[in-house]
């Protein structure tokens, strides 16, 4: 069985205020079963950006249809970028656990930084 890898191809993503940013994340295996979440930052203070399981994230949309049973693309789009959105974003695979899911593997992260202002 192939070991799951979390692939975030861009180390740095330059974004423009007011525009939409696409953060890429693909997995190489669907196992173990469990959700993929997006965070900004690391450690106990990290900010949840998107949870495929539950929650309301009005500025976030998924690139792919996550309800496909064979989906391996967990990329997201964040709309209406502001300076407050800069930081490093991680897609993180959790394996199922009781009572809480357990963090299984994290992607290497994508740093989002502001590029040149639109002219």
């Amino acid at each position: 069985e192939e070991e799951l890898q979390m692939i975030q191809p861009e180390k740095l993503l330059l974004v423009t205020v007011g525009k939409t940013a696409t953060l890429h994340c693909t997995v190489t295996s669907l196992l173990p079963v469990g959700p993929v979440l997006w965070f900004r930052g690391v450690g106990p203070g990290r900010e949840l950006i998107y949870n495929q399981k539950e929650g309301h994230f009005p500025r976030v949309t998924t690139v792919s249809d996550l309800t496909k049973r064979n989906n391996m693309d967990f990329s997201i789009r964040i709309s209406s970028i502001t300076p407050a959105d800069v930081g490093t974003y991680y897609c993180v695979k959790f394996r199922k656990g009781s009572p809480e899911n357990v963090e299984f593997k994290s992607g290497p992260g994508t740093e989002m930084a502001l590029g040149a202002k639109p002219s």
Partner: antibody, heavy 118, light 107 residues
Framework: DVQLVESGGGVVRPGESLRLSCAAS????????MSWVRQAPGKGLEWLAG????????YYIDSVKGRFTISRDNSKNSLYLQMNSLTAEDTAVYYC???????????WGLGTLVTVSS | ALTQPASVSANPGETVKITCSGG??????YGWYQQKSPGSAPVTVI????KRPSDIPSRFSGSASGSAATLTITGVRVEDEAVYYC???????????FGAGTTLTVL
């Protein structure tokens, strides 16, 4: 409130076809995967097929693959099951069910009865 | 195939456990569905191993460990009499499977 209402059941002869519908309301239909489950008389529940929210991805149990087709029309908030080459073994109550994020079920319809008899 | 006992019985107020075995913990999520009479609409009592819908009483709980899942009814009531089906979603095959059902009789 989430509501799923199946229709289209009835009595057909072996070899004939039938199309079941499931009308959904009370939730954003286009955001959820859906499934069909059946129950033959005196038997247990049997999952038949599931379809992704966008409708491009479908899976079937082996016994209906090639005979049944699951589809959906998100503009009409409707799920369908096209059943061809029906046999007596397909006699059952057919339920539509909304899927959770991990392809289990949270809401069910009341079911529609399909009887295949000569 | 998922295996569950054909029947269990209990007195009101007792704790009932129904097991469902045959899935692979690494690749399977479990759910539990209550059907009060044949042909009536099933009701989801547990999904995602241990998640209880908001309208289901707290006496229903679920757990999963190894190759088995367990539905526990703590302080069973007469109205809990029903057939309980376990189901699994296998992330390896993308297929759902139901157990044969367990008839719960409250004496």
């Amino acid at each position: 409130d989430v509501q799923l209402v199946e229709s289209g059941g009835g009595v057909v002869r072996p070899g004939e076809s039938l199309r079941l519908s499931c009308a959904a309301s009370g939730f954003t239909f286009s955001s959820y995967a859906m499934s069909w489950v059946r129950q033959a008389p005196g038997k247990g529940l049997e999952w038949l097929a599931g379809i992704s929210a966008g409708g491009s991805d479908a899976y079937y149990i082996d016994s209906v693959k090639g005979r049944f087709t699951i589809s959906r029309d998100n503009s009409k908030n409707s799920l369908y099951l096209q059943m061809n080459s029906l046999t007596a073994e397909d006699t059952a109550v057919y339920y539509c069910a909304r899927e959770t994020w991990n392809h289990l079920f949270d809401y069910w319809g009341l079911g529609t009865l399909v009887t295949v008899s000569s | 195939a998922l295996t569950q006992p054909a029947s269990v019985s209990a007195n009101p107020g007792e704790t009932v456990k129904i097991t469902c075995s045959g899935g692979d913990w690494y690749s399977t999520y479990y759910g539990w569905y209550q059907q009060k009479s044949p042909g009536s609409a099933p009701v989801t009592v547990i999904h995602s191993d241990d998640k209880r819908p908001s309208d289901i009483p707290s006496r229903f709980s679920g757990s999963a460990s190894g190759s088995a899942a367990t539905l526990t009814i703590t302080g069973v009531r007469v109205e809990d009499e029903a057939v309980y089906y376990c189901a699994g979603y296998d992330g390896r095959t993308y297929i759902n499977t139901f157990g044969a059902g367990t008839t719960l009789t409250v004496l």
